[in-house]
């Protein structure tokens, strides 16, 4: 049994780090492998993560952790029974992938404006709470040529779009993702998308 692609891990800077790797051949990850992790810290214990399959040769493990601080450093050992397949380390604060924003809602009852709101995925006491900026992707299933990214660089999780910039009488979808500039994170996954119908019509005298 051999590791083809070494484990790569990212942290949500809250309570979970996710490690993914590829094996040299088809593997029943949960039956054959264990990922052991231990914080480099006085009197810490070794904890075990049971991986899941992620495609035929891929494995993924969700490591449960305490809150993340910049000093945290983990040793990682990938075992197949009594055989050590790989040994490495992981510093969560240096490999952050934020959680995806949630509760994306479209408000169309505001005159002339489409208002999109969503929730910050972190509690106020988390360091990322006040550091997230967002990208909102809006596209149309009726008009495949239409897809826009709106960068939201302010803290408030809202975006206002003049309804007149969207075509009337067709449906649109939106999704949102986040990143934290000061933590040099990757982008989060996209939130689930939400759909709405743009029924806005310009006033008669403007046509």
């Amino acid at each position: 049994m051999k590791v083809l692609q070494e484990p790569a891990c990212v942290s949500d800077y809250m309570s979970i780090s996710t490690c993914e790797w590829k094996m040299g051949g088809p593997t029943n990850c949960s039956a054959e492998l264990r990922l052991l992790y231990q914080l480099v810290f006085q009197s810490s214990e070794t904890h075990t993560c049971v991986p899941e399959n992620n495609g035929g040769v891929g494995c993924v493990c969700h490591l449960l952790m305490d809150d993340v601080v910049s000093m945290d450093n983990y040793t990682l050992d990938l075992w197949a029974g009594q055989q050590l397949l790989w040994k490495g380390s992981f510093k969560p604060s240096e490999h952050v992938k934020p959680r995806a924003p949630g509760n994306l809602t479209v408000h169309t009852n505001v005159s002339d404006t489409v208002l999109l709101t969503w929730s910050n995925p972190y509690p106020p006491d988390n360091y990322l709470y006040n550091d997230l900026t967002y990208a909102v992707n809006i596209w149309s299933e009726n008009d495949p040529a239409y897809s826009r990214i709106h960068n939201v660089t302010y803290l408030k999780p809202t975006l206002r779009i003049p309804a007149s910039t969207l075509k009337s009488g067709i449906s649109y979808r939106a999704r949102v993702r986040a990143w934290a500039q000061h933590y040099n994170t990757t982008w989060s996954e996209w939130s689930p998308s939400t759909k709405w119908y743009n029924s806005y019509r310009e006033p008669f005298e403007q046509r």
């Epitope: 914080l39 810290f41 006085q42 009197s43 810490s44 214990e45 070794t46 904890h47 449960l64 952790m65 305490d66 601080v69 910049s70 000093m71 945290d72």
Partner: antibody, heavy 125, light 112 residues
Framework: EVQLVESGGGLEQPGGSLRLSCAGS????????MTWVRQAPGKGLEWVSS????????YYADSVKGRFTISRDNSKNTLYLQMNSLRAEDTAVYYC??????????????????WGQGTTVTVSS | DIVMTQSPLSLPVTPGEPASISCRSS???????????VDWYLQKSGQSPQLLIY???KRASGVPDRFSGSGSGTDFTLKISRVEAEDVGFYYC?????????FGQGTKLEIK
């Protein structure tokens, strides 16, 4: 009531051995790291050794490394310090103390919040 | 190893007056914000040490509020707002960030 009671001290000749015990009660013994601290006559406190809750991680002062062994039996709620190749400078009162909660991924520290009454070890010919 | 240096080593105090003991570590014992791995212990004559302050500034259960801890990084202070006769004994600071745990030399507090 959370309590630690040491035993096993006594008079031993240089080069001899002693085994100290520390019985814990009133808390979930296996969840906590444990520590031994000693105090030579008229001197200050000196850390000797620590062990994680499961016993998988052990730590020693340079002055005792290779001679002393810390261990624990969580089924008996008891901590041990096996002392071999004793020297005159090991003469001290030995205290066991309850250390950090080590079952969490990052052990939670509340100080050495419970101490035993101490057991006296005298090494002399 | 982290060296802990206490001062003063002897502290005569009048009852009711404040007292202050300093402890300096040879390297930072700050792990993360609010987590300075420094404790303060009091050892009264003929007794086991007892915990007063942990993580730099957190008062242990049952410790009177006249005791307080402060500081961060490498410089720490134990303050007693109004010394009482029962406070006499040796005070030790200790770092527990990493083994070997190390203690200060001890400060003897006595009543004038």
């Amino acid at each position: 009531e959370v309590q630690l009671v040491e035993s096993g001290g006594g008079l031993e000749q240089p080069g001899g051995s002693l085994r100290l015990s520390c019985a814990g009660s009133g808390f979930t013994f296996r969840d906590f790291a444990m520590t031994w601290v000693r105090q030579a006559p008229g001197k200050g406190l000196e850390w000797v050794s620590s062990i994680s809750g499961s016993g998988s991680s052990t730590y020693y002062a340079d002055s005792v490394k290779g001679r002393f062994t810390i261990s624990r039996d969580n089924s008996k709620n008891t901590l041990y310090l096996q002392m071999n190749s004793l020297r005159a400078e090991d003469t001290a009162v030995y205290y066991c103390a309850k250390d950090r909660l080590s079952v969490t991924v990052r052990p939670r520290y509340y100080g050495l919040d419970v101490w035993g009454q101490g057991t006296t070890v005298t090494v002399s010919s | 190893d982290i060296v802990m240096t206490q001062s003063p080593l002897s502290l005569p105090v009048t009852p009711g007056e404040p007292a202050s003991i300093s402890c300096r570590s040879s390297q930072s014992v700050l792990y993360s914000i609010g987590y300075n791995y420094v404790d303060w212990y009091l050892q009264k004559s003929g007794q086991s040490p007892q915990l007063l302050i942990y993580l730099g500034n957190k008062r242990a259960s049952g410790v009177p509020d006249r005791f307080s801890g402060s500081g961060s990084g490498t410089d720490f202070t134990l303050k007693i707002s109004r010394v009482e006769a029962e406070d006499v004994g040796f005070y030790y600071c200790m770092q527990s960030l990493t083994s070997p745990y190390t203690f200060g030399q001890g400060t003897k507090l006595e009543i004038k």
